[in-house]
């Protein structure tokens, strides 16, 4: 009976069975029912789903473009993934917004002890952060290399300058 | 040029390219180039995008094929980042926009993202970057010092 209000009397390409399949697969990836999955496991998870929610590998760039919210520890909430995948199937519509709201309300109400979570970044932002981090890291390693070469050059000159003193 | 890219990079670029090659004809439009690059973590300005297009879209037909795209990305990856680009990169981690990053945040970013620095490298980085030891890094000054010839 999951999401029966959201999908009631609907001939949409998404039905109750698809949501049940999502949660059945989710349980395998989140056996402790934390509601979160590590970003590093997301690619495997969405590849394991059945159509129409599945995003087959290679899917890393696709997942980046979904711009999923992430919380500290690079974890993603199951609802955010489900919303994004649902949106991929249904497209961006008023119906999608209504479905999302219904699903979210039902989910939160069904799990009243769970703490609300504050996303700090998204998959798209994280990719940008990765690229920016690499720029800084390469610049710093270049700087270290140049500095050690300068030191080596200085030591070399210094040792050769002093060699003719005898 | 493209032989300087790793297998992993080429696979990633291929995936991004294919994702936006909607009709599967092996080309993307120059309009889509920005979207493709953003999905790869790049944030090119309109002017930069135009320069890249001018370089690779020789016949000016408004489309780019994968080999051209690879060449373009390889050029972009090979270029040594300017002082301004490195400053921009730091700015991404400056959540308050006040010109400072905490040493703790810098350590976290440098050891967890990208081409991760070793503990020794990051210790040395923070020694150089947090000059007065107050736990805050003025990255403007640090970038100048790093890029000084």
């Amino acid at each position: 009976e999951n999401f029966n209000v959201a999908t009631e009397e609907s001939s949409e390409p998404l039905g109750e069975d698809d949501f049940e399949m999502f949660y059945e697969t989710w349980e395998k990836f989140d056996p402790d029912a934390t509601q979160f999955i590590a970003y590093s496991r997301l690619s495997d998870f969405v590849d394991t789903l059945q159509e129409p929610l599945r995003i087959a590998k290679p899917n890393k760039i696709k997942l980046i473009t979904l711009d999923l919210p992430m919380v500290p520890g690079d974890k993603i909430h199951c609802l955010d993934i489900l919303f994004a995948l649902t949106k991929e199937v249904l497209g961006d519509s008023g119906e999608m917004d209504a479905l999302k709201q219904t699903m979210e309300e039902k989910f939160m109400a069904a799990n009243p002890s769970k703490v609300s979570y504050e996303p700090i970044t998204t998959t798209l932002k994280r990719k940008h952060e990765e690229v920016c981090a690499i720029k800084i890291q390469r610049a710093y390693r270049r700087h270290l290399l140049q500095r050690s070469m300068k030191q080596a050059s200085y030591m070399y000159r210094h040792s050769h300058d002093g060699s003719g003193d005898d | 040029m493209a032989d300087q890219l790793t297998e992993e990079q080429i696979a990633e670029f291929k995936e991004a390219f294919s994702l936006f090659d909607k009709d599967g004809d092996g080309t993307i439009t120059t309009k889509e180039l920005g979207t493709v690059m953003r999905s790869l973590g790049q944030n090119p300005t309109e002017a930069e995008l135009q320069d890249m297009i001018n370089e690779v879209d020789a016949d000016g037909n408004g489309t780019i094929d994968f080999p051209e795209f690879l060449t373009m990305m390889a050029r972009k990856m090979k270029d040594t980042d300017s002082e301004e680009e490195i400053r921009e990169a730091f700015r991404v981690f400056d959540k308050d926009g006040n010109g400072y990053i905490s040493a703790a945040e810098l350590r976290h970013v440098m050891t967890n993202l990208g081409e991760k620095l070793t503990d020794e490298e990051v210790d040395e980085m923070i020694r150089e970057a947090d000059i007065d030891g107050d736990g805050q890094v003025n990255y403007e000054e640090f970038v100048q010092m790093m890029t000084a010839k």
């Epitope: 009976e1 999951n2 999401f3 029966n4 949501f19 949660y23 989140d30 402790d32 029912a33 934390t34 509601q35 199951c78 039902k106 989910f107 109400a109 069904a110 799990n111 009243p112 002890s113 769970k114 703490v115 609300s116 | -």
Partner: nanobody
Framework: QVQLQESGGGLVQPGGSQRLSCAAS????????LAWSRQAPGKQREFVAS????????YYSGSVKGRFTVSRDNAKETVYLQMNDLKPEDSAVYYC?????????????????WGRGTQVTVSS
């Protein structure tokens, strides 16, 4: 085994109040999320309210928010539903449900434990 027993239903006038109770046994009550759901004749069962084990505020459906209050007494292993300003459309069989708070479910329908229900009729 786990048992949930609702009580407190009956006939009440529009605008009146009623308090439902649900006594639980066979579970570690303090570790369980608890919910109230209702079903009117010919309609689907609908969520009314839920309360967790943490200090999170309870959840209410839009149709009862501001009129109904859910509460729990861990010592008495009982969950309550205080219903004020009752309307004829609140008439239904009211069910109590429970699940382990550490387990995540998609909707209230997935709660494993349910009571038999108590009838509330709002009529003049």
């Amino acid at each position: 085994q786990v048992q949930l027993q609702e009580s407190g239903g009956g006939l009440v006038q529009p605008g009146g109040s009623q308090r439902l109770s649900c006594a639980a046994s066979g579970l570690t009550f303090a570790n369980y999320d608890l919910a109230w759901s209702r079903q009117a004749p010919g309609k689907q069962r609908e969520f009314v309210a839920s309360i967790g084990v943490t200090r999170n505020p309870p959840y209410y459906s839009g149709s009862v928010k501001g009129r109904f209050t859910v509460s729990r007494d861990n010592a008495k292993e009982t969950v309550y539903l205080q219903m004020n300003d009752l309307k004829p459309e609140d008439s239904a069989v009211y069910y109590c449900a429970a699940k382990d708070a550490s387990v995540t479910v998609a909707t209230i329908e997935d709660y494993p434990y349910w009571g038999r229900g108590t009838q509330v009729t709002v009529s003049s």
